[in-house]
Amino acid sequence: AILGRSETQECIFYNANWERDRTNRTGVEPCYGDKDKRRHCFATWKNISGSIEIVKQGCWLDDINCYDRTDCIEKKDSPEVYFCCCEGNMCNERFSYFPEMEVTQPTSNPVTPKPP
């Protein structure tokens, strides 16, 4: 292991479409990949009227978006399918959504709403 970095060897596995895909429904997935590459865990889910439905969880291949992330956090604003990735064994057991507010510079004078 590289100092200060948690290597990912296994992740929580889940597949909502397990019957169609002929896989297990839940379990632990050992992560394989080229030995020169980093490995991560991921989680995908949907928010159906406030109810969280997990789509898939498992291993994710070398991705700089996941480097040094110990927590699985989706930061994209209102995606159709939520996705997060992280480093460290079973780090995808818990996942969360914290949208990153994009700070955009106004290109012209900001419009002040008229009082009612």
């Epitope: 394989y32 991921f42 789509v55 498992g58 991705d63 978006n65 994209k76 995606p79 996705f83």
Partner: antibody, heavy 115, light 111 residues
Framework: QVQLVQSGAEVKKPGSSVKVSCKAS????????INWVRQAPGQGLEWMGT????????SYAQKFQGRVTITADTSTSTAYMELSSLRSEDTAVYYC????????WGQGTLVTVSS | QSALTQPRSVSGSPGQSVTISCTGT?????????VNWYQQHPGKAPKPMIY???RRPSGVPDRFSGSKSGNTASLTISGLQAEDEADYYC???????????FGGGTKLTVL
Amino acid sequence: QVQLVQSGAEVKKPGSSVKVSCKASGYTFTSSYINWVRQAPGQGLEWMGTINAVSGSTSYAQKFQGRVTITADTSTSTAYMELSSLRSEDTAVYYCARGGWFDYWGQGTLVTVSS
Amino acid sequence: QSALTQPRSVSGSPGQSVTISCTGTSSDVGSANYVNWYQQHPGKAPKPMIYGVSRRPSGVPDRFSGSKSGNTASLTISGLQAEDEADYYCGTFAGGKYYGVFGGGTKLTVL
């Protein structure tokens, strides 16, 4: 071993669309991205876009925005790239590649646009 | 999303070393270790030679090395061999919040 096998060569008329497929094997398809890259005859590589194979989330190069659609069918481990409103300048070899690092490539699909 | 800049061509004799540069901006090459190098022989698909600035995929000879200084990444090939004659492209990681971009390519001639 990891393999990406692409569909065969296509000849298309200007204004029409083409859909190229890329079937992945030798790894878990839903564990990475699939990128699409094209190369016109005698020219360099040009990135077109990417898809997260598990979430379906896509990003496209500005140049192709509105004209390219990348999709993934997880049940067959196949990614697709559809390019519409074809013109002669779209004549190129189209490649799919695995992951953000483009570590494995398909064999390429020649798309010829000619009237 | 503008292309990275590479020299059109470089050349060297067998046994010599050559370096190919790839210049971008502080928001692409300069911002993170996410530059890749690919080798392409005529009529073939590109082959990854270096990724993440300096990481070498297994199977790639250690004659190939990558580095970065500021907004410029470099590929150095030492002990040139005839089979190294090819086109070389730099490119960035693409996926998630990162958009891909390639250099224009450099033709390496082994004299």
